[in-house]
């Protein structure tokens, strides 16, 4: 399906609004430090050029690839060297190396100020004064902070953002209407970004075979009535979409995602009974709905897998003839029977089955060798089941904040070399698994919990790759995607770690503590907790609890004092001394 002008093709397929939005997202994800106005200027130039190509596909430069056109445009930025340093060297390269170079310089933790939410009236005025600029600013600010955000999904978030302002800026109580909606968009956006980051890591670090295996398992759980051939077709298309988005090919990605949604809605009968309500929605909402659709009901009478995958005399023959197809069918059959398993567990089971066949099909008596293969799965299944049970019990006993603290201590002891902000961020997010998953019925707990933990641990891996400090983290992150969580779970106290010297400055607090939000107070306390564990990695739970209780009491006392700063100055050193004594 070749076109004389790729840029004209995508402009016509996507329409001007989506085209401009996606180009802005692409540029913002590549040049994360550039000011908004600079990006808007570049996007307008690209859009004007695209229109000339729509008018005449043979016009000069219209035959160039999108990477060439976009890369040339990015390389016109005057301050490239001063702002981005060695990223400017990318511009000396030819495509496709230039795009690869830009991709490698995407920064998962850019040094950007946290977004401050203005007063509601200020936001509503800005929205009414220039709606288009207001929405572009949203795309820009999110994209530059989340350089792997799933671009077509970001357009959906922007549409919801617009709808929230359109509705709430007319409301009697603007704040009561708007703020919960913005909070929800922020939380959903962060979750969406992290999920997409795992997909991109899977493709980039472990290859498309790893992503396809993940997709086979997940889609087989979602669509257990679909035939294997149908699931395989969806997996192939989905892999193309995510490969494109993760590779910065956002126009192609959005176009192919729309095609996939169209295909699914035209073939509902052979996919799932749950697609109906998604397919009546407009494009962005439809694609989002299809991605989030609940699992269809399992067919009533699925037979055991033993006949085809253990008892059949053709197991090794079928495996040898087409290894990936045979394993794919095994994964499909297993996953459609087990919506109660995490995708990562299903992939571990498929890996174990593959390893058994590799060993046994070369043995003297293959059947005898693999006859008990399913029995070997039991410990693999029980490990995450027990982990979820234990952690949900702990969460129910402690509540979210204290559960996060337990995880902070646990993970700081495992990998004390990791930076404190990273340990706090990751452990806080690990702790959110409780509220998210533990309230669910038994059959939904493991898929919720383990697949969420995989997303959070990927964030740790991504941040650690930028600044590697721990061999243990590198090992867990790089050896096996599906075994990352068990690898981290299995880590013990790092005996080789030399405790961090005590620094009183780290435990010095001021009156500004009192004006912080509850969340910010928690982060301050949790930062102190990590530093304590880094100083005394062998401290007991009781010792740490004692110090944290004293800390809370000290802060509460000083925040109630008339002269708060004086109280912090006087009581702070006493708290530090008492803490050191308690941990001695």
């Amino acid at each position: 399906d070749t076109h004389k002008s790729e840029v004209a093709h995508r402009f016509k397929d996507l329409g001007e609004e989506h085209f401009k939005g996606l180009v802005l997202v692409a540029f913002s994800q590549y040049l994360q430090q550039c000011p908004f106005e600079e990006h808007v200027k570049l996007v307008n130039e690209v859009t004007e050029f695209a229109k000339t190509c729509v008018a005449d596909e043979s016009a000069e430069n219209c035959d160039k690839s999108l990477h060439t056109l976009f890369g040339d445009k990015l390389c016109t930025v005057a301050t490239l060297r001063e702002t981005y340093g060695e990223m400017a060297d990318c511009c000396a390269k030819q495509e496709p190396e230039r795009n690869e170079c830009f991709l490698q310089h995407k920064d998962d933790n850019p040094n950007l100020p946290p977004l401050v939410r203005p007063e509601v009236d200020v936001m509503c005025t800005a929205f009414h004064d220039n709606e288009a600029t207001f929405l572009k600013k949203y795309l820009y600010e999110v994209a530059r902070r989340h350089p792997y955000f799933y671009a077509p999904e970001l357009l959906f978030f922007a549409a919801r953002y617009k709808a929230a302002f359109a509705e709430c800026c007319q409301a009697a109580d603007k704040a009561a209407c708007l703020l919960p909606k913005l909070d929800e968009l922020r939380d959903e956006g962060k979750a969406s970004s992290a999920k997409q980051r795992l997909k991109c890591a899977s493709l980039q670090k472990f290859g498309d075979r790893a992503f396809k295996a993940w997709a086979v398992a997940r889609l087989s759980q979602k669509f257990p009535k679909a035939e294997f051939a149908e699931v395989s077709k969806l997996v192939t298309d989905l892999t193309k979409v995510h490969t494109e988005c993760c590779h910065g090919d956002l126009l192609e990605c959005a176009d192919d995602r729309a095609d996939l949604a169209k295909y699914m809605c035209e073939n509902q009968d052979s996919i799932s009974s749950k697609l109906k309500e998604c397919c009546d929605k407009p494009l962005l909402e439809k694609s989002h709905c299809l991605a989030e659709v609940e699992n269809d009901e399992m067919p009533a009478d699925l037979p055991s897998l033993a006949a085809d995958y253990v008892e059949s005399k053709d197991v090794c023959k079928n495996y040898a003839e087409a290894k990936d197809v045979f394993l794919g069918m095994f994964l499909y059959e297993y996953a459609r029977r087990h919506p109660d398993y995490s995708v990562m567990l299903l992939l571990r089971l498929a890996k174990a089955y593959e390893a058994t066949l590799e060993k046994c099909c070369a043995a003297a008596d293959p059947h005898e060798c693999y006859a008990k293969v399913f029995d070997e799965f039991q410990p693999l299944v029980e490990e995450p089941q027990n982990l979820v049970k234990q952690n949900c019990e702990l969460f129910e006993q402690l509540g979210e904040y204290k559960f996060q603290n337990a995880l902070l201590v646990r993970y700081t002891k495992k990998v004390p070399q990791v930076s404190t902000p990273t340990l706090v961020e990751v452990s806080r997010n690990l702790g959110k698994v409780g509220a998210k998953c533990c309230k669910l019925p038994e059959a939904k707990r493991m898929p919720c919990a383990e697949d969420y933990l995989s997303v959070v641990l990927n964030r740790l891996c991504v941040l650690h790759e930028k600044t590697p400090v721990s061999e243990k983290v590198t090992k867990c992150c790089t050896e096996s995607l599906v075994n990352r969580r068990p690898c981290f779970s299995a880590l013990e106290l790092d005996e080789a770690y030399v405790p961090k010297a005590f620094n009183a400055e780290t435990f010095t607090f001021h009156a500004d503590m009192c004006t912080l939000s509850e969340k910010e107070k928690q982060v301050k306390k949790q930062t102190a907790l990590v530093e304590l564990v880094k100083h005394k990695p062998k401290a007991t739970k009781e010792q740490l609890k004692g110090v944290m209780d004293n800390f809370a009491a000290f802060v509460e006392k000083c925040c109630k004092a008339d002269d708060k700063e004086a109280c912090f100055a006087e009581e702070g050193p006493k708290f530090v001394a008492a803490s050191q004594a308690a941990l001695a």
Partner: nanobody, 115 residues
Framework: QVQLVESGGGLVQPGGSLRLSCSAS????????MGWYRQAPGKQRELVAS???????HYADTVKGRFTISRDNSKNTLYLQMNSLEPEDTAVYYC?????????WGQGTQVTVSS
Amino acid sequence: QVQLVESGGGLVQPGGSLRLSCSASGSIWGIYHMGWYRQAPGKQRELVASITVDGSTHYADTVKGRFTISRDNSKNTLYLQMNSLEPEDTAVYYCDIRNVGGDYWGQGTQVTVSS
């Protein structure tokens, strides 16, 4: 070794009710399907009702609205509540539990509906 034992069968008049139980002893992990089947003399064994791991229930058209399948995970027990029984429901009722590695059947319990 997994053993399934059905109970609750018997003789009942048309319009009456019975509750079948199937209790599993031994260790069976990774169950994805639990079902009740029946076999009338000279006929094939047929699915009456099943419940899958996702909580979906399925019923044969002939028993819909009259029979209810349920399970008690803590007791490893499967139930079949049979109301408005008809002479055509006369059969041996078997319970079946499946995991990927195998299909486990009980010995069956006789249900006779007759006046």
